[in-house]
């Protein structure tokens, strides 16, 4: 078979604090030493690019500055980190996996994580 | 909207060269892979190259391979196919598509005609 | 180089039948198969992705099937503006392969 599986968790619930972490994780059927990963957003039939990183194996992750996304991988699995994330924001997040170089080029993409944000509750005002 | 607009087109003899235009607009070039897709006449659809995001990664078809070169500059929003040592084989409508968030072409440029005759 | 076939090449149908175009790769491409339409003398168009997820703007009446090697197109209630060329396309790895056809007539 020539495609290549991700997987990454069903469900994720993001902290008090708008933070949601979850791992990807991609069964490569080749050797890549150049390989991107992009977080997609679903909502309705609308998809959207959340964030992306390219890097070499055994290198770091390296988003954009002004990126939400931070990560760090470990030979086939990435761990991902969305943070800001507000109550309006949940919803399914794709992880999609490029082997980029050398070829053969792969393409993978995850079934989703439905990451469900929750806003905290205003604290109550307090007379002490 | 989110449109592109190929240009550069014409006949041209064989051996000759030809450098094929795609102007993009409506999207940011460098959060996609972009294709190159030629029909010849009356025959289906042949995919020709990709060129990825910052433009270090390309793949050509092993019908072009040596040939064609792929090249993109993302602050025209631009991309371009140099033609090298056409042949009659390589006449066809040449199609600029976007290569989607999930990996199918999304979008399609309306074709330029590329007719390689003596 | 993974290879997709079409059947049929072509085919002639009534308006209202409900028809049905099949793509097999020579090997497993999971669900990463599009579908596109291209009308006489115009630019192809997205109708399917991942096998089955209709393209925004596409009508109900196409649907997508099928995952591994064995994938199935379906017009349920074929109408005039369906005349076409369908071609089907793997794009989960390099070369982004194309079916070479299937053209749609109404009978």
């Known amino acids: 078979c020539k495609a290549m599986h991700v997987a990454q968790p069903a469900v994720v619930l993001a902290s008090s604090r708008g933070i949601a972490s979850f791992v990807c994780e991609y069964a490569s059927p080749g050797k890549a030493t150049e390989v991107r990963v992009t977080v997609l957003r679903q909502a309705d039939s609308q998809v959207t690019e959340v964030c992306a990183a390219t890097y070499m194996m055994g290198n770091e992750l390296t988003f954009l500055d002004d990126s939400i996304c931070t990560g760090t991988s470990s030979g086939n699995q990435v761990n991902l980190t969305i943070q800001g994330l507000r109550a309006m924001d949940t919803g399914l997040y794709i992880c999609k996996v490029e082997l980029m170089y050398p070829p053969p080029y792969y393409l993978g993409i995850g079934n989703g994580t439905q990451i469900y944000v929750i806003d905290p509750e205003p604290c109550p005002d307090s007379d002490f | 909207q989110v449109q592109l607009v190929e240009s550069g087109g014409g006949v041209v003899q064989p051996g000759r060269s030809l450098r094929l235009s795609c102007a993009a607009s409506g999207f940011t070039l460098s959060s996609y892979g972009m294709h190159w897709v030629r029909q010849a006449p009356g025959k289906g659809l042949e995919w020709v190259a990709v060129i990825w995001y910052d433009g270090s990664n390309k793949y050509y078809a092993d019908s072009v391979k040596g040939r064609f070169t792929f090249s993109r500059d993302n602050s025209k929003n631009t991309l371009y196919l140099q033609m090298n040592s056409l042949r009659a084989e390589d006449t066809a409508v040449y199609y600029c598509a976007r290569g989607g968030l999930t990996g199918a072409f999304d979008i399609w440029g309306q074709g330029t005609t590329v007719t390689v005759s003596s | 180089d993974i290879q997709m076939t079409q059947s049929p090449s072509s085919l002639s149908a009534s308006v209202g039948d409900r028809v049905t175009i099949t793509c097999r790769a020579s090997q497993g491409i999971s669900n990463y198969l599009a579908w596109y339409q291209q009308k006489p003398g115009k630019v192809p168009k997205l109708l399917i992705y991942?096998?089955?997820t209709l393209q925004s703007g596409v009508p109900s009446r196409f649907s997508g099937s099928g995952s591994g090697t064995d994938f199935t197109l379906t017009i349920s209630s074929l109408q005039p503006e369906d005349v076409a060329t369908y071609y089907c396309?793997?794009?989960?790895?390099?070369?982004?392969?194309f079916g070479q056809g299937t053209k749609v007539e109404i009978k």
């Open positions: 991942a096998a089955s």
């Open positions: 396309q793997k794009y989960n790895s390099a070369p982004w392969t």
